[in-house]
Amino acid sequence: AFGISGVQKYTRALHDSSITGISPITEYLASLSTYNDQSITFALEDESYEIYVEDLKKDEKKDKVLLSYYESQHPSNESGDGVDGKMLMVTLSPTKDFWLHANNKEHSVELHKCEKPLPDQAFFVLHNMHSNCVSFECKTDPGVFIGVKDNHLALIKVDSSENLCTENILFKLSET
């Protein structure tokens, strides 16, 4: 089990951390949905894409993302979502060669085609929250999380640890 800790506890660790090696410690294929059970879906072409937050039809298959889990090298003494004092980070890929990226200037979540090693913008600290929910905090901008805004994904600033449980930054992972 992972604990919940305040956003600010991660600030130094995030800025100082680097990803151990180039290989993830594990990978997991899962559908991504919001706290309110709307699905995250992707419409992706070579030169364009859309990311939707929507209700799916009964017969429609859910889109899946490949979550690759990495440990950061920075050992943290604070209680956090880590293993053996290390933070757990993830990258999210809906298909081969494409990854979710944080665009902190535009406060947007984008899909980029890129080669490994991935840039820091593709890494998110994984927080395990209540009710089997998770949240994704930008490695490049501590305190900023992937969230839902106007039926799209966006980057949302969370000012205090109390707001870590706000519904619009909570997501559910499911194998189905």
Partner: antibody
Framework: EVQLLESGGGLVQPGGSLRLSCAAS????????MSWVRQAPGKGLEWVSA??????????YYADSVKGRFTISRDNSKNTLYLQMNSLRAEDTAVYYC????????WGGGLRYPFGYWGQGTMVTVSS | SYVLTQPPSVSVSPGQTASITCSGE??????AAWYQQKPGQSPVLVIY???KRPSGIPERFSGSNSGNTATLTISGTQAMDEADYYC?????????FGGGTKVTVL
């Protein structure tokens, strides 16, 4: 610009074989599921076969009417889709279209997207 | 196997609205796509996911889908809209087309 160019059609006797090709350009061929759709003269569209993109392992799918006789395949290095047609019957006479999914196939996505791009078709006539 | 049923023909006067139906069991639980095909040409996608239009398709084309019926609506029909129209869904990894509807602009 997305382009799909079919070739390989022609006249063949019942029981014979043909291999259709679809040369693709203007997009990352390996990322998309591809299909063959046919249209008999004066008739409607009929889905024939499809093959996944590399997001879903390149698995083939077939309509019941061609299962066991037709084989779909792809060569991603050549950006080419194929349809090997054996034991051809008169009812296989049709224009055969190559079609690309509207979007890139996602991990484990299966077949679910519409056909966003179509080739011009190649005519296959099965007759003695 | 899954069956989609369309009316063979629909006639409409220029400027009027043409509605083409596509019926199938629990159709509303699936996403419907619509294709336009003019004589001697390849099909063109005009509606996908029930209601969405690809870029380049005029706004007069719209779609809906609920219950057992999907509908393609052409508002302010023009002479250039005269064509065959096909609905399509995926059912258990099998592509299924309707029989097609010939739209005649009188």
């Amino acid at each position: 610009e997305v382009q799909l160019l079919e070739s390989g059609g022609g006249l063949v006797q019942p029981g014979g074989s043909l291999r259709l090709s679809c040369a693709a350009s203007g997009f990352t061929f390996s990322s998309y599921a591809m299909s063959w759709v046919r249209q008999a003269p004066g008739k409607g569209l009929e889905w024939v076969s499809a093959i996944n993109g590399d997001g879903d392992g390149g698995r083939p799918y077939y309509a019941d009417s061609v299962k066991g006789r037709f084989t779909i395949s792809r060569d991603n290095s050549k950006n080419t889709l194929y349809l090997q047609m054996n034991s051809l019957r008169a009812e296989d006479t049709a224009v055969y279209y190559c079609a690309r999914d509207l979007w890139i196939q996602l991990w484990g996505g299966g077949l679910r997207y519409p056909f966003g791009y179509w080739g011009q078709g190649t005519m296959v006539t099965v007759s003695s | 196997s899954y069956v989609l049923t369309q009316p063979p023909s629909v006639s409409v006067s220029p400027g009027q609205t043409a509605s083409i139906t596509c019926s199938g069991e629990r159709m509303g639980d699936k996403y419907a796509a619509w294709y336009q095909q003019k004589p001697g040409q390849s099909p063109v996608l005009v509606i996908y996911q029930d209601t969405k239009r690809p870029s380049g398709i005029p706004e007069r084309f719209s779609g809906s889908n609920s219950g057992n019926t999907a509908t393609l609506t052409i508002s302010g029909t023009q002479a250039m809209d005269e064509a065959d129209y096909y609905c399509q869904v995926w059912d258990s990894s099998t592509g299924v087309f309707g029989g097609g509807t010939k739209v005649t602009v009188l």
